[in-house]
């Protein structure tokens, strides 16, 4: 899951393997920092849990498209951008 290596950088070292239903997601943010081993998406669930996901996965792309289109995603201060 998300792991703060040194404030304010948040990186994803592992990504979720199983698909999460879009109805369980309420927002996302992009991780692109060069201090992180990989680019990633962090989803926030309706239960306020943060989950790392692989942005290349089709379900992840579909989920962020859905969140953008339905404006469910609110602007989260990106904790790490490249």
């Amino acid at each position: 899951g998300p792991d703060a290596v040194s404030t304010p950088v948040t990186c994803c070292y592992n990504v979720v393997k199983q698909k999460i239903h879009v109805r369980k997601l309420k927002s996302y943010r992009r991780i692109t920092s060069s201090q992180c081993p990989r680019e990633a998406v962090i989803f926030r669930t309706i239960l306020d849990k943060e989950i790392c996901a692989d942005p290349k996965e089709k379900w992840v792309k579909n989920s962020i498209n859905h969140l953008d289109k339905t404006s469910q995603t609110f602007i989260l201060e990106p904790s790490c951008l490249g």
Epitope: R30, S34, P37, E39, K56, I75, P78
Partner: antibody, heavy 117, light 107 residues
């Protein structure tokens, strides 16, 4: 630190082909998408296409289909752009860039391609 | 394809000015907009992604706003080092497309 190294310049004859390289350091190209962007002299930026180095899947702007081929070698962590049947219209700076989300946060310094007749 | 239009190709500005550069898409791009700065002889530099998110290391005088089809890059107090060409780019759908660029020149 992420770095995308590109050779400075290439001079090639019209009708020939050229293969431009973009070796990456500070990242594993398998984890991202590698893109190529064209900029003609005194003009704007045009996205050519991208590759997913993990599986070789490519996506192009239709206007570059047939002109451009994008490949990647994960063992050398390098992306390539091949341009065929070169004309003066291909004279430009070609940039490689990384970005899994469709925007480009790290860029190479660009290779200037000059097509001579 | 989604077309991106930057209304002005060049701007004559004074140091210390507030500068606003606009960008319009031919369809809704759902905030999937990036802004780049390019100086002569250099590669573009990403300033903003997701319409509003400032990249690390970019001065806070830069900001992005907008939604739907219409987006804006603002520079609150123009500095010498901000004289450059600025491009918007949509990343809602491939082929990803750039605006034509807006060049800032000192009066």
């Amino acid at each position: 630190e992420v770095q995308l190294q590109q050779s400075g310049a290439e001079l090639v004859k019209a009708g020939a082909s050229v293969k431009l390289s973009c070796p990456a350091s500070g990242l594993n190209i398998k984890d991202t998408y590698m893109h190529w962007v064209k900029q003609r002299p005194e003009q704007g930026l045009e996205w050519i296409g991208r590759i997913d180095p993990a599986n070789g899947n490519t996506k192009f702007d239709p206007k570059f289909q047939g002109k451009a081929t994008i490949t990647a070698d994960t063992s050398s962590n390098t992306a390539y752009l091949q341009l065929s049947s070169l004309t003066s219209e291909d004279t430009a700076v070609y940039y490689c860039a990384r970005g899994v989300f469709g925007f480009f946060d790290y860029w190479g310094q660009g290779t200037t391609l000059t097509v001579s007749s | 394809d989604i077309q991106m239009t930057q209304s002005s190709s060049s701007f004559s500005v004074s140091l210390g000015d507030r500068v606003t550069i606009t960008c319009k898409a031919t369809e809704d791009i759902y905030n999937r907009l990036a802004w780049y700065q390019q100086k002569p002889g250099s590669a573009p530099r990403l300033l903003i992604s997701g319409a509003t998110s400032l990249e690390t290391g970019v001065p806070s005088r830069f900001s992005g706003s907008g939604s739907g089809k219409d987006y804006t890059l603002s520079i609150t107090s123009l500095q010498t080092e901000d004289v450059a060409t600025y491009y918007c780019q949509q990343f809602w759908s491939a082929p990803y497309t750039f605006g034509g660029g807006t060049k800032l020149e000192i009066k």
